[in-house]
Interface confidence: medium
Amino acid sequence: GITIPRNPGCPNSEDKNFPRTVMVNLNIHNRNTNTNPKRSSDYYNRSTSPWNLHRNEDPERYPSVIWEAKCRHLGCINADGNVDYHMNSVPIQQEILVLRREPPHCPNSFRLEKILVSVGCTCVTPIVHHVA
Amino acid sequence: GITIPRNPGCPNSEDKNFPRTVMVNLNIHNRNTNTNPKRSSDYYNRSTSPWNLHRNEDPERYPSVIWEAKCRHLGCINADGNVDYHMNSVPIQQEILVLRREPPHCPNSFRLEKILVSVGCTCVTPIVHHVA
C-alpha cells in the first residue's frame, strides 16, 4: 500500500465519538463487466461537440485523479468539419462521490464528499430569447 | 440515528484484521461551490443525440438511486428534426464510486464499489470499415 506521512492529529479509529463514522473496506469491487470494454474511448474526438480532457489531481482525494471534460468549441462541428454557431456544445455534468483525507495526510481517515464533474459534451439546439 | 435490523455476521469495527479498512466521516461535504453551481438543464431533450433517463435503484447502495442515460436513437437528429443514420448517438460513460452495505444490513460497515454509468449521449461520426 501507500505510505502517507501521518498527521499527529489523526482521529483514533476506535474513538466512539469520531463523528458519524463508519468502517469502509477499500478492496474495491468492480461491477464493470467486460461486456463493453471499449466505452467512451475516442468519442471526445469523434463527437460533433468534441472535448478535451483535463487532469484534475488531488493527492488528498480518492480517486486522486479525475478527468474533466472541457468543450472545444461554443458551436458544434457540421458535416463539412466546420464549427456551426447555430448549435451549442455543452458539458454533461454529474455529481459523484469521492473520499477526502480528513484531517489531511491521515492514512485511514476520510470524509465523504460530493463533487460535480463534466464527463463529456453534447450538441444542443440553442434556446433563442426573442426581444419584444 | 437509524435502527437497522442487525446482521449477526457484521464485522467488528475494532478488528485489526478487517481488510484494508478506513474510517469514513459521513458528514457529506458538498464541493459544488458558487463558481460551479448546479444549473438544471434539459440537454437530454435538446441534444442532437437525445436520451431518456432510467431510474436504477438499489437500497443496499449509496447513492441508492442512480439515473442511467439511454440514447433514444441509433442515429442523430439533423436540422430538419429527422434521424440521420450517417451519424451515431453514443452514451458517454463514467466510472463512479458507490458505497455498498457489506455484509448486507450492517449499519456501519461498507465496501467501496466502482460502477460504470451512462451520463448522457453525444453524436459521433461513425467509424467506417472498408472491406478490401
Epitope: - | 459521513l26 441508492s64 439515473w67
Partner: antibody
Framework: EVQLVQSGAEVKKPGESLKISCKAS????????ISWVRQAPGQGLEWMGG????????DYAQKFQGRVTITADESTTTAYMELSGLTSDDTAVYYC???????????????????WGQGTTVTVSS | EIVLTQSPDFQSVTPKEKVTITCRAS??????LHWYQQKPDQSPKLLIK???HSISGVPSRFSGSGSGTDFTLTINGLEAEDAGTYYC?????????FGQGTKVDIK
C-alpha cells in the same frame, strides 16, 4: 406511490417533550431522506432537520440544535421527530416530507420535498 | 443561512389572469429552487423542482424559470382551484430555507 402517514394530534404542557412518528410506505425507505418541517398558526414553513436513512445521519437547523432528535427505524419504515423543552412557541403543525436524496445528473432533483405527510397538530398550553 | 424573499406577499387575481410570483435568494443557488402550493388545511404540494422542471400530475399552466438568485413561478390562466399560498424552497445549502409565502386569492 409513496405515502407518509403521521401520528395524531398532541396537546402538551410547557417543558414537556413531544415525539411524532411518520410511517412511510411505497418505494425503498433506505433510498431517501426524511425531513421535518413545521408551520406555526398563520405562518410560513420552517425546516427543522432531516435524516439520511441510508446512513442514519442527521442534520438540524441551528435554531433547534440540542432540542430536536430525528431518528428512523428501517424495520418499520418509520421516522421519528422528538422535540424537548416545549414552549407555547412550539404550537404548530409538524410535517414530515420525503427528500429523494438523489445525486445530481443534470436534470433530476436531489433535495426537493416530493411527498408530504398529512401533518400533526401540536398545541402547547399550560 | 440563505434567505429567500418572495414578492408579492399577497395577490388577488381574476380567473384566467396570469400570475407571476418572484423569489430572490440572498446568494447564488444555481437552480436548486423548488416551488410548493399549499391550500388551507392541507399539506404543501410540490409544483416545480429545480427552478423549471414540471412535476407529473401538476397542470401545465404552472411553470418556473430563473437561476442564480432570481426565480419566477408563473401561473398561465389562473383557475379557482389555484387559490392558496405558494412557497419557494432552496436546497443548495443547509439549512433548507423557505420564502415567506405568497397568498393568492380569487377575485
Amino acid at each position: 406511490e409513496v405515502q407518509l402517514v403521521q401520528s395524531g394530534a398532541e396537546v402538551k404542557k410547557p417543558g414537556e417533550s413531544l415525539k411524532i412518528s411518520c410511517k412511510a410506505s411505497g418505494g425503498s425507505f433506505r433510498s431517501y431522506g426524511i425531513s421535518w418541517v413545521r408551520q406555526a398558526p398563520g405562518q410560513g414553513l420552517e425546516w427543522m432537520g432531516g435524516i439520511t436513512t441510508f446512513f442514519g445521519i442527521t442534520d438540524y437547523a441551528q435554531k433547534f440544535q440540542g432540542r430536536v432528535t430525528i431518528t428512523a427505524d428501517e424495520s418499520t419504515t418509520t421516522a421519528y421527530m422528538e422535540l424537548s423543552g416545549l414552549t407555547s412557541d412550539d404550537t404548530a403543525v409538524y410535517y414530515c416530507a420525503r427528500d429523494p436524496n438523489e445525486f445530481w445528473n443534470g436534470y433530476y432533483a436531489t433535495h426537493d420535498f416530493d411527498y408530504w405527510g398529512q401533518g400533526t397538530t401540536v398545541t402547547v398550553s399550560s | 443561512e440563505i434567505v429567500l424573499t418572495q414578492s408579492p406577499d399577497f395577490q388577488s387575481v381574476t380567473p384566467k389572469e396570469k400570475v407571476t410570483i418572484t423569489c430572490r435568494a440572498s446568494q447564488i443557488i444555481g437552480s436548486e429552487l423548488h416551488w410548493y402550493q399549499q391550500k388551507p388545511d392541507q399539506s404543501p404540494k410540490l409544483l416545480i423542482k429545480y427552478a423549471s422542471h414540471s412535476i407529473s400530475g401538476v397542470p401545465s399552466r404552472f411553470s418556473g424559470s430563473g437561476s442564480g438568485t432570481d426565480f419566477t413561478l408563473t401561473i398561465n390562466g389562473l383557475e379557482a382551484e389555484d387559490a392558496g399560498t405558494y412557497y419557494c424552497h432552496q436546497s443548495y445549502d443547509l439549512p433548507h430555507t423557505f420564502g415567506q409565502g405568497t397568498k393568492v386569492d380569487i377575485k
